[in-house]
Amino acid sequence: EAGLPRAGGGSQPPFRTFSASDWGLTHLVVHEQTGEVYVGAVNRIYKLSGNLTLLRAHVTGPVEDNEKCYPPPSVQSCPHGLGSTDNVNKLLLLDYAANRLLACGSASQGICQFLRLDDLFKLGEPHHRKEHYLSSVQEAGSMAGVLIAGPPGQGQAKLFVGTPIDGKSEYFPTLSSRRLMANEEDADMFGFVYQDEFVSSQLKIPSDTLSKFPAFDIYYVYSFRSEQFVYYLTLQLDTQLTSPDAAGEHFFTSKIVRLCVDDPKFYSYVEFPIGCEQAGVEYRLVQDAYLSRPGRALAHQLGLAEDEDVLFTVFAQGQKNRVKPPKESALCLFTLRAIKEKIKERIQSCYRGEGKLSLPWLLNKELGCINSPLQIDDDFCGQDFNQPLGGTVTIEGTPLFVDKDDGLTAVAAYDYRGRTVVFAGTRSGRIRKILVDLSNPGGRPALAYESVVAQEGSPILRDLVLSPNHQYLYAMTEKQVTRVPVESCVQYTSCELCLGSRDPHCGWCVLHSICSRRDACERADEPQRFAADLLQCVQL
């Protein structure tokens, strides 16, 4: 089953770890109040303490199943032979308002379980209606969801969920908005937020698209809410570059997708190509992203307020090999303000009757934009025309850091005392710690100041999550969760080494002659008691 916490990390003090030797790990979430860690895996859901001791394990598989059985065998007898089938956890979300965990798997056409947070007791497993089947695709890192709580004391919670469908467009929408009921056994659970004969809260990949491009699918890498919008970062087959000939080379494009939270008919659907470029090299394969707030310094440099959202992203080079992308990759920065502005400009242009809707995978014809006098502001959520809308120009991010050797796979970020720290997981199992400062001398917008091993030789998976107190970073590989301290100031034994490290967390604590955080140093606010700048070392 699951191993005990054990030592890790090279010359660092041992990191706390949780090992799961039998079952591959897929997803990780951290409870923002308790700090407890929930881990999704193949056939298991784990609950761990903040220091990674195992508190509970819940078995989700294997189950007797066959991917061809629709509906699943638990609902209707199936002519296909059943076999022991792994249940891969594909979505793991905390529903704070209902004190439950939503865990969606690959088995039984992609049904979800609701587990009580305290003890992982199964509260419900809706599985008898077609709306309960999200997708039978087994790939763990291809589905993303955002849970939207209902207005306090009233209103419905809902789940926005995106998933690949493996050609089964008659069974599964690629993107949908579902009702989340308080009672797990409620018949309306996972029902579409809106549905009539013509429109509903879902997008299906049209059968014509799949006829022409049988490999066409959309892979959902990251999703988040910002203001009144839900966004997805996706990878999809590029139908402009890929030949319909199945034997031809496949090219992929990264898209940012946006919907209004309160748009049950999906009239606000917009997608734009997204990527970044550095020294003539295009980085177009999105690997991970992380929504954050800029530190005071970065906000000032970007001309943003400190409470505005920014998006840190990792892109691999080029447009080929989605599953095994090139090692060369880039950490890039987008501001939501710029993304919103680009989208608004495109909508405004379309409502002036300029151009076409430009969404070939979704529309079976090149619909022209309709001229209309409507005022399009930042909050515009669409009409029943000029939708769905595709961007024709790539939204380009600011490249911060390029890794040519290891390959960046995951990203997280936070603001430490006004400075922006980014953590990037790599293909070799390392965590790179990066200080983002657009005013760096020499014009380098980011400085990689430390690299630590989480698990040697195993790629860091996407769910790189900070503990609620921002003291630790939880990094996950297929077999292990590692708790990495955000700083290891104590490893630096002199003032010069301490401040020469450029770790923004670290300063020289004069009273104890140790390198530490400011808040760990007695009388740090008194003059000459805490050195935060290399020049101060000489003075001390």
């Epitope: 009539d196 014809k365 619909l367 001229n371 409507l374 009409q383 025309f385």
Partner: antibody
Framework: EVQLVQSGAEVKKPGASVKVSCKAS????????ISWVRQAPGQGLEWMGW????????NYAQKLQGRVTMTTDTSTSTAYMELRSLRSDDTAVYYC????????????WGKGTMVTVSS | SYELTQPPSVSVSPGQTASITCSGD??????ACWYQQKPGQSPVLVIY???KRPSGIPERFSGSNSGNTATLTISGTQAMDEADYYC???????????FGGGTKLTVL
């Protein structure tokens, strides 16, 4: 059953105004728009405009801009169409229709209201 | 302003296939709808989004749209299909919905 029930026939003098009502039932009124279409005797259909019952946005046919006003009352699930400065060529059957969307057409129609403009 | 042109009348024998055309500039770049109107009655939507049938509309009604022409096809035409048929699309420059002039279908 989804229904649109329109007000009764009207006879008006040239230069006057007419206001036709359309009461919806059997569906969530604010989930759809209402289009207004007219048909002069022995003639074809002419689209007059559309109003969103969700947010009140309107789009009027260019030919009628300035003479037509469409409104809704969500509390009674009723749509209204007012046409001003009536002329004899405004004599027609006026239909309200549930607007399913630009791409989907008008899927439920009222029975029509005959408006006669005559001096 | 955008115009849709339909033949004033089409005749067909019972059981045969009737085709009613609707032409307009680059109509294939828009979605076309078709309405049936019997004498003294309100119009009924029979085809939307070029090819789709609303619930309750018989399978013998089908639609297509490409280039400059949309076509409503009624296979195995019945006497009850005798009616006026209107196509409808939109004017991209004004957002107006536009109807064709209508076609009277006579089942001989």
């Amino acid at each position: 059953e989804v229904q649109l029930v329109q007000s009764g026939a009207e006879v008006k003098k040239p230069g006057a105004s007419v206001k036709v009502s359309c009461k919806a039932s059997g569906y969530t009124f604010t989930s759809y728009g209402i289009s207004w279409v007219r048909q002069a005797p022995g003639q074809g259909l002419e689209w007059m405009g559309w109003i969103s019952a969700y947010n009140g946005n309107t789009n009027y046919a260019q030919k009628l801009q300035g003479r037509v006003t469409m409104t809704t009352d969500t509390s009674t699930s009723t749509a209204y169409m007012e046409l001003r400065s009536l002329r004899s060529d405004d004599t027609a059957v006026y239909y309200c229709a549930r607007h399913a969307g630009y791409y989907y057409g008008m899927d439920v129609w009222g029975k029509g209201t005959m408006v006669t403009v005559s001096s | 302003s955008y115009e849709l042109t339909q033949p004033p009348s089409v005749s067909v024998s019972p059981g045969q296939t009737a085709s009613i055309t609707c032409s307009g500039d680059k109509l294939g770049d828009k979605y076309a709808c078709w309405y049936q109107q019997k004498p003294g009655q309100s119009p009924v939507l029979v085809i939307y989004q070029d090819t789709k049938r609303p619930s309750g509309i018989p399978e013998r009604f089908s639609g297509s749209n490409s280039g400059n022409t949309a076509t409503l096809t009624i296979s195995g035409t019945q006497a009850m299909d005798e009616a006026d048929y209107y196509c409808q699309a939109w004017d991209s420059s004004t957002a107006d919905r536009v109807f064709g002039g209508g076609t009277k279908l006579t089942v001989l």
